[in-house]
């Protein structure tokens, strides 16, 4: 996208002792319009069950243009990934609403010890070609021990990270069949350049 | 994750010369000072019970100027609504802390089926003059089945949305009597232009 | 707000019909590069038990440079505090993941009343030299009544506040021994100037 509006340079008088510019120097700073920063808000869609590797949480796929969902300014979505088009600091967030049914988990004991509870987990993961292993940026994990009822609850995550051009972001969950995909306001994923 | 045979991830060819913008290009952009962007952080006040329509969650009202609360740069609060003064992408957030008391919900069964649990829900809603139906932007909903005790817990929501000048934002809850209005840091609502 | 670094002016050609500046007008605004704004993302480390005053929640200490953690542009971390280097509006966030083990809390009653449940609490606190009392900016508090199991769950907080140069931010928790310090993506604390 070409920006439509004007070249800015900023001129200022440096403070005494200022680290990066001598006094009175004309400084060209990387100013830019907020409106042209990469941004995306993705919303839930019905998930197609996919095979995934043992010990690897499956990734959710998302709606990127209908309803509340959008991508803009070179932030693209493809194949479960948000693609980072520009290096910088991004705020990244996601909420996943889970729903399911659990048995009375306190009644199942192993050798007198409390049982390991069922749990739900959301991970926002970064894949980068400058590091061989996916990096878990954010994790929300919660035991679920809901005493025999139908239960539902959200996990929300959000934080700021330094990302590089070409990085890919995805949202992984512990059990894709428990994700509430019924409403775009319940389960979502987004990021924006600060 | 393995994709079903024949299913492709979206592939596109970058423009020759590269993906974003030619270097050295003169860029025109609507720059503006960050300090003059519309922003608000509202905090909880004691709610006066109001009649609301069946099947419609009541809206909370808020403190907008005392303590931690503020509105600035033409972002106004009136009659439970935040008024959006300028079109753009906004980050919108809210936390509502609920408290109450539940019976042992696993003991109440209907025809042998697990009962539908009590629940708590927060919705951030957008009202637009040009559109007859309010739009639910964000929803956090949670079953509450707390085994006979006094319980309390927060629901947090936050995401980015493209809003238009004149849009109105409100926070709706499933049961206004369960909202903890005792402290400004427990229940709040805010938005800022990115 | 006083700028620490110089007065910027930006000159641009206004769009036809633009509301706020006639064509060719020189506009003076506190513009600044987004990349030089104070920002920090801190991640959990193993906590050393410290003595704290009765009725005062202990503060967590943090990793500020390894892994995902960073501080930049004069935002410094020292001795459990984030130090605010410049007045302005900041988005502040934290997640704390707790884990523990509770007894069946519904079975313990006092004089026939439901028991006061165990709870977990996170508070983001501001300390200002010019004000004797710390200010609680954000609180997430949750009853824990998990029916005899090992449990774990996060509390997430985030909101925008107007801070002054010299303010200090910390994260306090109700019980430091319940904090999950095992992974940098589970428990974190951050802030950035808007």
């Amino acid at each position: 996208q070409l920006r439509a509006q004007g070249e800015a340079c900023v001129q200022f008088q440096a403070l005494k002792g200022q680290e990066f510019a001598p006094s009175h120097q004309q400084v060209y700073a990387p100013l830019r319009a907020d409106g042209d920063k990469p941004r995306a808000h993705l919303t839930v869609v019905r998930q197609t069950p996919t095979q995934h590797f043992k010990n690897q949480f499956p990734a959710l796929h998302w709606e990127h243009e209908l309803g509340l969902a959008f991508t803009k300014n070179r932030m693209n979505y493809t194949n479960k990934f948000l693609l980072i088009p520009e290096s910088g600091d991004y705020f990244i967030y996601s909420q996943v609403t889970f729903r399911g049914m659990t048995s009375e988990c306190s009644e199942i004991r192993q050798a007198g010890r409390p049982n390991k509870p069922d749990s739900i987990t959301v991970v926002i993961t970064k894949v980068t070609d400058s590091y061989p292993e996916p990096t878990q940026l954010l994790m929300g994990t919660k035991s679920v021990c809901e005493v025999g009822s139908n239960w539902f609850q959200p996990i929300y995550l959000g934080a700021m990270f330094s990302l590089q051009e070409g990085d890919k972001l995805m949202v992984n969950v512990s059990d894709i069949s428990l994700v509430d995909y019924t409403k775009e306001d319940k389960t979502f994923f987004g990021a924006f350049l600060l | 994750q393995l994709r079903a045979q024949g299913e492709a991830c979206v592939q596109f060819q970058a423009l020759k010369g590269q993906e974003f913008a030619p270097s050295h290009q003169q860029v025109y952009a609507p720059l503006r000072a960050d300090g003059d962007k519309p922003r608000a952080h509202l905090t909880v006040v004691r709610q006066t019970p109001t009649q609301h329509f069946k099947n419609q969650f009541p809206a909370l009202h808020w403190e907008h100027e005392l303590g931690l609360a503020f509105t600035k740069n033409r972002m106004n609060y009136t009659n439970k609504f935040l008024l959006i003064p300028e079109s753009g992408d906004y980050f919108i957030y809210s936390q509502v802390t609920f408290r109450g008391m539940t019976s042992e919900c696993s003991e109440i069964r209907q025809a042998g089926r697990p009962n539908k649990p009590d629940s708590i829900t927060v919705v951030i809603t957008k009202v637009t003059d040009s559109y007859p139906e309010p739009t639910q932007l964000l929803m956090g909903t949670k079953s509450v089945c707390e085994v006979g005790s006094n319980w309390f817990q927060p629901i947090y929501l936050g995401a980015m949305f493209s809003l238009q000048e004149g849009d109105k934002l409100m926070v709706n809850v499933s049961d206004i009597s369960l909202v903890d209005y005792t402290k400004e840091d427990k229940t709040f609502f805010g938005a800022f232009l990115l | 707000q006083l700028r620490a670094q110089g007065e910027a002016c930006v000159q641009f050609q206004a769009l036809k019909g633009q509301e706020f500046a006639p064509s060719h007008q020189q506009v003076y605004a506190p513009l600044r590069a987004d990349g030089d704004k104070p920002r920090a993302h801190l991640t959990v480390v193993r906590q050393t038990p410290t003595q704290h005053f009765k009725n005062q929640f202990p503060a967590l200490h943090w990793e500020h440079e390894l892994g995902l953690a960073f501080t930049k542009n004069r935002m410094n971390y020292t001795n459990k505090f984030l130090l605010i280097p410049e007045s302005g509006d900041y988005f502040i966030y934290s997640q704390v993941t707790f884990r523990g083990m509770t007894s069946e809390c519904s079975e313990i009653r006092q004089a026939g009343r439901p028991n006061k449940p165990d709870s977990i609490t996170v508070v983001i606190t501001k300390v200002t030299d010019s004000y004797p009392e710390p200010t609680q900016l954000l609180m997430g508090t949750k009853s824990v009544c998990e029916v005899g199991s090992n449990w774990f769950q996060p509390i997430y907080l985030g909101a925008m506040f107007s801070l002054q140069e010299g303010d200090k931010l910390m994260v306090n928790v109700s019980d430091i021994s319940l904090v999950d310090y095992t992974k940098e993506d589970k428990t974190f604390f951050g802030a950035f100037l808007l």
């Epitope: 194949n79 693609l83 894949v127 | 991830c9 | -």
Partner: antibody, heavy 116, light 106 residues
Amino acid sequence: QVQLVQSGAEVKKPGASVKVSCKASGFDICDTYMHWVKQRPGQGLEWIGRIDPASGHTKYDPKFQVRATITTDTSTSTAYLELSSLRSEDTAVYYCARSGGLPDVWGQGTTVTVSS
Amino acid sequence: EIVLTQSPGTLSASPGERATMSCRASSSVSYMYWYQQKPGQAPRPWIYATSNLASGVPDRFSGSGSGTDYTLTISRVEPEDFAVYYCQQWSGNPRTFGGGTKLEIK
């Protein structure tokens, strides 16, 4: 089992083109990045470039930018390296490799010989 | 581009000895990666992100360093360790390899 299987050896004349393939199995190539690396006989390793199969975005070492083209066919989980206007100094073993997911995996290599 | 210089070009060692090889970058990099290559075989990932051993790599190997100076160390060389070791940086585009250090039997 996670592996990369490359196409067989090629003998080409100067000025011709060659297209080497690298078929992935045991993982989704869109979850990673695919790289190509050159090794001339008795020499060290040279990085040619990489592709993000999810988007098609590529990056190259400038010295390979003009004559190398990296593509993928995600429906068959295959990455390709095409070299045009072949010269004698293109005689080498070409390896594909993935990054962005452990363990890092390399193909067995494809020998390309350019000879008149 | 970032140039990686490996030294020595050839390192002679006897089984049981300690062996150390160096990789120096022309400018600072975030991480260093090391590969082992034996004649007629593809390179094998050996150490990733400066100090993490790839799957199956014996713990007599270790990696260290930061900024521009990185080191691969073998605490006690075994016969199967004789090979060429390449360092690689992934911090800047293009990715670059060092020229290699050949570990040979003394």
